[in-house]
Interface confidence: low
């Protein structure tokens, strides 16, 4: 048998196989060792007994999607029956003191690996040692602590294979400088020890892709926006674009990245070398924005032709239908029509080519509660002898859209302990104009935090007041007024952040 | 390829509703908005409103506003206008389209729906 | 909202001329408009976009001219399936606003 009538559902067509050389990894046209690495199919009944106490599921994941170039990365994670786990010598215990179905376990091997083999099974170039190869014969490598590797991990893709040794987990990168772009499938196979050979315990596959487009996110936020995840934002206040470029292995590093930003609302095209960028819209209604992500990357230099003609200045239009955005954080990759790009061996080339990532996104514009501001702060004044209780009446402003409810919250002097909180619908003036009167139990200093918000938006201020004690002659003192930062930094009197 | 495949002619009396739909195919619905324009007969073309599918945002022309009403359903690809209060000025071929790539004005159309306002 | 005032609203033309139909926005637009064909019984058929570039399939006897609030659509050469209906539309901004139309009959 062939490595590929062992591994592969996924037959790879021949003419494929020249464009998608991997460095170190070889030809599923060899011969796989059927004598020390049986070979059952689905459904045969020893895969149930392959293991003790139940089925061992292996679970792959990459940093798929990849650029062209770049490198991508796979692991294998082993996933034990229950109570089971890998000690640090590499053999297969029960955890102490959890129930599986047998009851409770004590500490007990469940394979004992490393002391079941004398030590002359280990020992090179005797007839002893040659059970300790991978399918296709090559012996084993015997780097420091080799013995505690207990698994024997198959990597399977365009027509390739890859072994190693190890031990509750594996990981294996590829370079994807020659292949084509792409959807291309991985899939691994992991044998255990069984005397002198090797049974298999799990299979896996998982899809990966390789995209000639730079895969790009962008998020979005904006101060007083009520849902950062709706694509609705505020008329007149500032939009923060982050675009996050997926790029795992760091294939883009030595590269200048331009961002090519149209915000569809004829403000025109903004090029920026930064990833963020800070919009403001100033109509209301729906707006379509287009960013373009270009950069260089090491590539394949052309053949040598006296009739080459120069590469064209202009990014490649984008397909009419791009994939999800934002709402649905998957990178915006695009259709890439699968085109096969022959690369010859490029480490003594210093060619480079553009490469261009796109997002869209199609995001609404509305009116919102752009500022809110205490403008005011009364003592109600009180019959005599006094209450326990002090009353405050605070006189609230804001800008912008007319808010449809009020909260006021009174907390302790950090603004961390809330001690009390009020919602209530409001019915505010044109001017907005909001008075609300509030009763404060006892002296000290409390942090009042106001918001204001409709539907679309939700905005903030807080200030610290110090109720003074029962002397008459004691004034009331707003301390400060003042908002948060994420980070609940205090900033300057009369500035009304979110 | 990009498709917009109307809702069949209308008869409706007046003061009644009419429900026109608009199913897309060919294209990943959310990503582009949806245009609504009427043509009474012998006439031009008027822009009624705009619906981003992805989040349901509407934008219309002051003189539709409270007569059409936009939505988009994302699992049937399809957006609808409803058209309320019918009265015989209503009587109109109406169209929706979609945007070209960069959302430049009306790429694709509908073929168009026939609606008759008579008692 | 921003007003379309397209002129003629109507002309008839003989085959092989080159006709001229303008479209005037009480505002300036940059190059945001568009123009579109209408055959009877048909939807509008795209033309030409952002002023002066030619969708894709539209033979280049037609062309877009301006910027600013004065735009023009040019037919050189009439042929016979040119004769029908053309629209400006501004997609400067909300609510898009079409031209009253411009008939062009055969003469």
């Known amino acids: 048998k062939r490595f590929r009538d062992v591994l592969g559902h996924e037959q790879y067509p021949d003419h494929m196989r020249e464009h998608n050389q991997l460095r170190g990894w070889s030809s599923d046209e060899n011969e796989w060792d059927e004598h020390l690495y049986p070979v059952w199919r689905r459904g045969d009944g020893r895969w149930k007994d392959s293991w003790e106490g139940g089925r061992v599921q292996a679970v792959l994941t990459s940093d798929s999607p990849a650029l062209v170039g770049s490198n991508i990365t796979f692991v294998v994670n082993l996933v034990f029956p229950r109570c089971q786990k890998e000690d640090a010598n590499g053999n297969i215990v029960y955890e102490k003191n959890c129930r599986n179905d047998l009851g409770l376990t004590s500490d007990l091997h469940v394979y004992n690996w490393t002391a079941g083999a004398d030590d002359g099974d280990w020992e090179d170039g005797t007839s002893r040692s040659q059970h300790l190869r991978f399918p296709d014969r090559r012996p084993f490598p015997r780097p420091h602590g080799w013995k505690k590797w207990s698994f024997v991990y198959v990597f399977h893709t365009l027509g390739q294979y890859f072994q190693k040794l190890g031990r509750c987990s594996a990981r294996v990168s590829i370079n994807t400088v020659n292949l084509t772009a792409g959807p291309q499938v991985m899939e691994v196979t992991v044998f255990r020890r069984y005397g002198r050979a090797y049974i298999p315990i799990s299979k896996v596959k998982d899809v990966y892709v390789i995209t000639d487009q730079i895969p790009v996110f962008v998020t979005m936020s904006q101060k007083n926006d009520r849902n950062l995840s709706d694509e609705i934002f505020l008329r007149d206040l500032p939009i923060v674009f982050d675009v996050l470029i997926h790029d795992p292995s760091h294939f883009l590093n030595d590269s200048a990245i331009s961002y090519k930003w149209n915000f569809g609302d004829n403000t025109g095209l903004f090029v920026s070398n930064n990833h963020t960028l800070n919009h403001t819209y100033v109509l209301n209604g729906t707006f379509n924005l287009n960013l373009t992500v270009q950069t260089a990357v090491p590539g394949p230099c052309p053949p040598p032709s006296p009739s080459t003609p120069p590469p064209p200045s202009t990014p490649p239009s984008p397909p009419p239908s791009p994939l999800p955005t934002l709402s649905t954080p998957s990178p915006s990759l695009m259709p890439t029509g699968y085109k096969s790009m022959e690369l010859s061996d490029i480490s003594n080339e210093n060619c480079r080519i553009n490469r261009y990532g796109y997002f869209r996104a199609t995001i609404t514009i509305v009116e919102g509660i752009l500022e809110v501001s205490i403008m005011q702060i009364a003592d109600v004044p009180m019959p005599t002898p006094q209450p326990a209780n002090s009353l405050m009446d605070f006189t609230v402003t804001c800008k912008g859209a007319t808010p449809m409810e009020a909260c006021t919250i009174i907390s302790d002097p950090t603004c961390q302990i809330a001690q009390n909180r009020v919602c209530s619908p409001v019915a505010v003036d044109g001017l907005c104009l909001l008075s609300v009167r509030r009763a404060f139990n006892g002296s000290g200093t409390y942090c009042v935090n106001f918001t204001l918000g409709d539907d679309a938006s939700l905005a903030l201020t807080s200030t610290l007041i110090s109720i003074p004690g029962k002397d008459p002659d004691s004034p009331l003192r707003a301390v400060n007024e003042f908002d948060y930062k994420d980070d609940d930094d205090k900033l300057e009197h009369h500035h009304h952040h979110h | 390829q990009v498709q917009l495949q109307q809702s069949g002619a209308e008869l409706v009396r007046p003061g009644t509703s009419v429900k026109v739909s608009c199913k897309a195919s060919g294209y990943a619905f959310s990503n582009h908005l949806i245009e609504w324009v009427k043509q009474r007969p012998g006439q031009g073309l008027e822009w009624i409103g705009v619906i981003n599918p992805g989040s349901g945002g509407t934008n219309y022309i002051e003189k539709f506003k409270g007569k059409a009403t936009l939505t988009a359903d994302k699992s049937s690809s399809t957006a609808y206008m409803q058209l309320s209060s019918l009265t015989s000025d209503d009587s109109a071929v109406y169209f929706c389209?979609?945007?070209?790539?960069?959302?430049?004005?009306?790429?694709?159309w509908g073929q168009g729906t026939l609606v008759t306002v008579s008692a | 909202e921003i007003q379309m005032t397209q002129s003629p609203s109507s002309m008839s033309a003989s085959l092989g001329d080159r006709i001229t139909i303008t479209c005037q926005a009480t505002q300036d637009i940059v190059k945001n408009l568009n123009w579109y064909q209408q055959k009877p019984g048909k939807p509008p058929s795209f033309l030409i976009y952002?002023?002066?570039e030619l969708a894709e399939g539209v033979p280049s006897r037609f062309s877009g001219s301006g910027s600013g609030s004065d735009f023009s659509l040019t037919i050189s050469n009439l042929e016979s399936e040119d004769f029908a209906d053309y629209y400006c539309l501004q997609f400067h901004e909300f609510p898009r606003t079409f031209g009253g139309g411009t008939k062009l009959e055969i003469k």
């Open positions: 952002y002023a002066t």
């Open positions: 389209a979609r945007g070209a790539n960069w959302d430049v004005g009306f790429a694709y």
